[in-house]
Structures are given as C-alpha cells and as structure tokens.
C-alpha cells in the first residue's frame, strides 16, 4: 500500500518555456519498484484544479483545470525510473508561476517547487548586408519576449562600445506578443570577428560571424537563463 | 483494459507501399512512446522505430533507410505505420507495441509481398 | 548497433522449475533492457522493462536483474502456461536490437 510515513527526495530544476512550442517541467524522485504504487500531482501556485496527476500507470485527469486540458502529459514509461517531468503542449505566457511536483510512493512522499518563466527566445543569424552602401552586418532572430537588449561585440576591438554604430529594432509579429529583432552594425572590417548578443530574463543568445576575404563563417548559440 | 486494436492482413506487389493503423484504448494515447516491431516467419524481432503521440516526433531504424513513416492521429487515438517501395522479404507480421509499462501489444498484422 | 547475444537459445524444464535466462548487450545500454514473452502464433507480451520493473499485470514469479552489459531474466515457479519463446531487447541507443531468443520447452 501506499505509505506516508517517510519522506522521500523529489528535486526539480527551474526552466523556461518558449510560448508556441512545446515546454519541459523537469522533476525526479526516488523510484518505487511498483508503477501501481506511484503517485505524481503537479500543482499551479493560484490555480484551483491540478496541472496534471498521473496514478497506477495513468493520468487522473478528472480534477484537471480547464487552462491545461489537453495540454500535459508525463513520460509515463519514465514514471518507473523516477522521472515525473511535466510536458506541457503549446505553452502559453499565462504558463509561468510556481509549480510544485508533489509524488507519493510506497516509500513515502515529497514534494518541491520550480519556478516556470515564459517568453519567447531564439537563434539569431548575422549576415553581411550587401544592399548597404558601406560593410554592414545585419543580425536577426525572428522571436523575442519581453522585449531584449541587443549588444555588439569585436574580437580585435574587445571592450569597444559600438551603440553608436548600430541600429536596432524590434517589429511585432503577427500574433501580437513576440516580436523580430534586427540590428545592423556599420563601418565593419574585414578579417574580424563580431558577435550579435541577445538577452532578456529568460534567454540568451549569440550569432557570431567572421569575413574574411575568401569566406564568411557564422556560428550561433542560446543558453537558458534558469533562475536559481 | 489497455487494448491496442490493429488494421487486417494486407497481400501486396512488390514496389507497393502498405499503410497498417493500431487504434489505442484505455490510457492516455498522449503519454506513452508507440513502437512498431516485425517479425518475419522464423526470425527474431526486428524494431523498426517509434512515434510520441505527444508531439509527433518520430525516431526510426536507419535499416529501412526512408522506407518507414510513422504518424499518429491523436483525435482517434491511432497511430500508424507505412512501409513503402515493399520487396519480398517485407514480409512480415508487424505489431504496434508498447517497450514500457503496459504488457499488452497489438495483435499483429500480417503483410505479405508477392507477385 | 548494439548486439544483443542471448542464451541459452532453448532450454526443457519442468513445471516449478527455476529458470534463469541471461542477455549479454555489446557495449553498455545501463538498464534500458526489455524482456517479452511469445507463444507461437501470437503478439509478444512485454514482461519487464528497464530491466528490473514489471509489466503492467504480469505475474511476481518473472523477475529482472542486471545493469550494464548482463542482464537476467528469472522465472522462479515455472507454469505451464510459461512454456514460450523469450526475448530481450535493448532501448538505449537507436537502433534498438531484440536478442534471438530463448525458447523454454517441456521436459
């Protein structure tokens, strides 16, 4: 039988969810040997209904509240081995808040908290800008929420500021929530490598590019920034 | 009761294509990976990929190299299995399946190529 | 790909029987391991999955162990309804690869 004499680890890792696609809420527990005797409920700070339970081998989805309705499931054959991760479909802004993974097992129960933030966050691209008249880069990433910063940086003027020869601007798209960011740089040179930076609350991201005289080469990466 | 029902045998032509339907009940269609699986007579079980109902996405066995798609409907709670440019050596009995959780697997349906 | 090399590939025993039937990967898959049961001329039944954990309504006397490369699956009472064709299977790196099998007859 279930028993809640003891307390068991449950540990989660705080994350972010990019509106429009599909979220991960990340949760672990000490594993049962018996999928009949776990118990995993996700639970919304401010929200009546549950988020998702999931018990005996299936979700329990009679007390689930209307906002996540169709929207969530569990690797249910990962529930054994003690992951309790939440998928969550079509993430919505709504979506952040405090989340607790509350699991009861045979060994006993816990629980813990994550903080869930949404926006929206992604890869920018930098390119030479030929229409320009002078050597102009133009650094674009389609989707941004809450509106970022967006820097320029050199790797042979490291520390410069180059505000004063860049351009940026923020164009909403057609849902009305994200927007495009563009950034145009002026006066570059040649055998140079620049970084477009890209920041908010939730995400970072980096498109950098190297032109030379005999090719362009560009590399791009985003890192989360999960609140500790 | 968990219960995976699969679609009837299919005799098909070499070069063919064969499109096989496993319609899921008693779980949540969303939660758990569905696996495809042939057997051809006398010989081991072959996995041939995997869909999550979840979103779609699929992973598959690079041996089929592109010859294998497969789909879920998630409105009818169906997932299924296509095998095109079929040769002779298709054929096989093929299964929905689950690798975790629930014992039961589909019935099996038995595809058969021949000229 | 991962080879799955399983043994014996038959074995006779009698009804109460312990048998141990054992499942050697190539190169370590953890315990992403799979046991399933057939008999002739019907779907497989998954019996143990990650190695260690019971199917869904599958009787205590079938057992998992191992972790790695090694894996065993052990029935403890054999039943007749038990005598079958086992196979195991590896889900830790794609392509996932089923044993050949180990076919568990009457004495």
């Known amino acids: 039988g279930i028993s809640g004499r003891h307390s068991i680890t449950v540990t989660t890792v705080a994350s972010a969810g990019n509106i429009g696609e599909d979220g991960i809420l990340s949760c672990t527990f000490e594993p049962d040997i018996k999928l009949s005797d776990i118990v995993i409920q996700w639970l919304k700070e401010g929200v009546l209904g549950l988020v998702h339970e999931f018990k005996e081998g299936k979700d329990e989805l009679s007390e689930q509240d209307e906002m996540f309705r169709g929207r969530t499931a569990v690797f249910a054959d990962q529930v054994i081995v003690g992951n309790a991760s939440l998928r969550l479909k079509n993430v919505q802004l709504t979506d952040a808040g405090t989340y607790k993974c509350y699991i009861i097992t045979s060994k006993g129960k816990g629980n813990a908290n994550l903080e869930y933030k949404t926006g929206a966050f992604s890869m920018p691209e930098v390119n030479v800008d030929y229409n320009a008249s002078s050597e102009t880069l133009r650094c674009e990433a389609p989707r941004w929420f809450p509106q970022p910063t967006v820097v320029w940086a050199s790797q042979v003027d490291q520390g410069a500021n180059f505000s004063e020869v860049s351009n940026t601007s923020f164009e909403l798209n057609s849902e009305n929530v994200t927007m495009k960011v563009v950034s145009v740089l002026y006066n570059v040179t040649i055998n140079n490598t620049y970084s477009c930076m890209i920041e908010n609350d939730i995400a970072k991201a980096t498109g950098d590019i190297k032109v030379t005289e005999s090719e362009i080469k560009r590399r791009s990466h985003l890192q989360l920034l999960n609140s500790k | 009761q968990v219960q995976l029902v699969q679609s009837g045998a299919e005799v098909k032509k070499p070069g063919a294509s064969v499109k096989v339907s496993c319609k899921a009940s008693g779980y949540t269609f969303t939660s758990y990976y569905m696996h495809w699986v042939r057997q051809a007579p006398g010989q081991r079980l072959e996995w041939m990929g995997y869909v999550d109902p979840f979103n779609g996405g699929t992973s598959y066995n690079q041996k089929f190299k592109g010859r294998v798609t497969i789909t879920v409907d998630t409105s009818s709670s169906t997932a299924y299995m296509e095998l095109s440019s079929l040769r002779s050596e298709d054929t096989a009995v093929y299964y929905c399946?689950?690798?975790?959780?629930?014992?039961?697997w589909g019935q099996g349906t038995l595809v058969t190529v021949s000229s | 790909d991962i080879q799955m090399t399983q043994s014996p590939s038959s074995l006779s025993a009698s009804v109460g029987d312990r048998v141990t039937i054992t499942c050697k990967a190539s190169q370590d898959i953890k315990s992403y391991l799979s046991w399933y049961q057939q008999k002739p001329g019907k779907a497989p039944k998954t019996l143990i999955y990650y190695a260690t954990s019971l199917a869904d309504g599958v009787p205590s006397r079938f057992s998992g162990s191992g972790s790695g490369t090694d894996f065993t699956l052990t029935i403890s009472s054999l039943q007749p309804e038990d005598f079958a064709t086992y196979y195991c299977l590896q889900h830790g790196e794609s392509p996932y690869t089923f044993g050949g099998g180990t076919k568990v007859e009457i004495k």
């Open positions: 399946a689950f690798i975790a959780g629930f014992a039961n």
